[in-house]
């Protein structure tokens, strides 16, 4: 089978601090040494890129400094964390994996993780 399968959890609940983490696992059909991982957000059939990182197998993922994502890799598994989430960011987050080098190129796209974000209630003023 030449197609690449990507697995990710169906649902994740963000923490009260607006942080959501999930694992993106891919079944590699090739011996890739350079992998690109992209997180996409799908809302109302519109797809936008949230963040992306390219890494060498065995090394850590490096997202851009201003990225809302961080992550670690272990074999064919990537642990992704998205921070700074608010209720309006609730949506389907898709893990896209590309085996970039050596050729041939392979693409794998997960079914998406529905991330629910609930804004924390403001603390009521208290009298002491």
């Amino acid at each position: 089978c030449k197609a690449m399968h990507v697995a990710q959890p169906a649902v994740v609940l963000a923490s009260s601090r607006g942080i959501a983490s999930f694992v993106c696992e891919y079944a590699s059909p090739g011996k890739a040494t350079e992998v690109r991982v992209t997180v996409l957000r799908q809302a109302d059939s519109q797809v936008t890129e949230v963040c992306a990182a390219t890494y060498m197998m065995g090394n850590e993922l490096t997202f851009l400094d201003d990225s809302i994502c961080t992550g670690t890799s272990s074999g064919n598994q990537v642990n992704l964390t998205i921070q700074g989430l608010r209720a309006m960011d609730t949506g389907l987050y898709i893990c896209k994996v590309e085996l970039m080098y050596p050729p041939p190129y392979y693409l794998g796209i997960g079914n998406g993780t529905q991330i629910y974000v609930i804004d924390p209630e403001p603390c009521p003023d208290s009298d002491f």
Epitope: K2, A3, K96, L107, G108, I109
Partner: antibody, heavy 118, light 107 residues
């Protein structure tokens, strides 16, 4: 408006060279991988080459490997295809196409005709 | 290289009829399959990606189905502007390959 416009096609003799250009507008060119696809007269579509957003990764069809070179200039929002050692079988309309975020070729140019004949 | 086979080569139908086009891959492409429409003298236009997702602006009469090696593009009721050539493409691995096309013409 999202647009791709190819140029540089023409008539060239076998063994000759040609450089095609594809000018992009209406989107952040530097964020997308790009492709060249060709179509011989009356025939189907054939993928030629692909280049990643930062030019780090390049792929070619076996039929053009060693003869064609894909490149891009993100500052100029332009994709290129340098074609050397041209053969009669390279005669085709050449299209540039953008790779959408989900993988398919979502935006295509109108094409430029390349004719290789003596 | 993944080889895509399309059938039939030509489909002769009348406006209002249902068109069913088939695409078969030589090995599994999962759901990394797209359908394109091409009219004479024009560039291809993306219709369907991910085997079943309509691209932006594509009418609901176009639908795609299938996964693995067998795929179908259905046009529920042909409009005059739908008579064209349709190509399937796999984009899951390089080299990216296209099927030979199915021509839908007016009976």
């Amino acid at each position: 408006e999202v647009q791709l416009v190819e140029s540089g096609g023409g008539l060239v003799k076998p063994g000759g060279s040609l450089r095609l250009s594809c000018a992009a507008s209406g989107f952040t060119f530097s964020s997308y991988s790009m492709n060249w696809v060709r179509q011989a007269p009356g025939k189907g579509l054939e993928w030629v080459s692909s280049i990643s957003s930062s030019s780090s990764y390049i792929y070619y069809a076996d039929s053009v490997k060693g003869r064609f070179t894909i490149s891009r200039d993100n500052a100029k929002n332009t994709l290129y295809l340098q074609m050397n050692s041209l053969r009669a079988e390279d005669t085709a309309v050449y299209y540039c196409a953008r790779v959408g975020l989900m993988g398919p070729f979502d935006i295509w140019g109108q094409g430029t005709m390349v004719t290789v004949s003596s | 290289e993944i080889v895509l086979t399309q059938s039939p080569a030509t489909l002769s139908l009348s406006p209002g009829e249902r068109a069913t086009l088939s695409c078969r891959a030589s090995q599994s492409v999962s759901s990394y399959l797209a359908w394109y429409q091409q009219k004479p003298g024009q560039a291809p236009r993306l219709l369907i990606y991910g085997a079943s997702n309509r691209a932006t602006g594509i009418p609901a009469r176009f639908s795609g189905s299938g996964s693995g090696t067998d795929f179908t593009l259905t046009i529920s009721s042909l409009e005059p502007e739908d008579f064209a050539v349709y190509y399937c493409q796999q984009y899951g691995s390089s080299p990216f390959t296209f099927g030979p096309g199915t021509k839908v013409d007016i009976k």
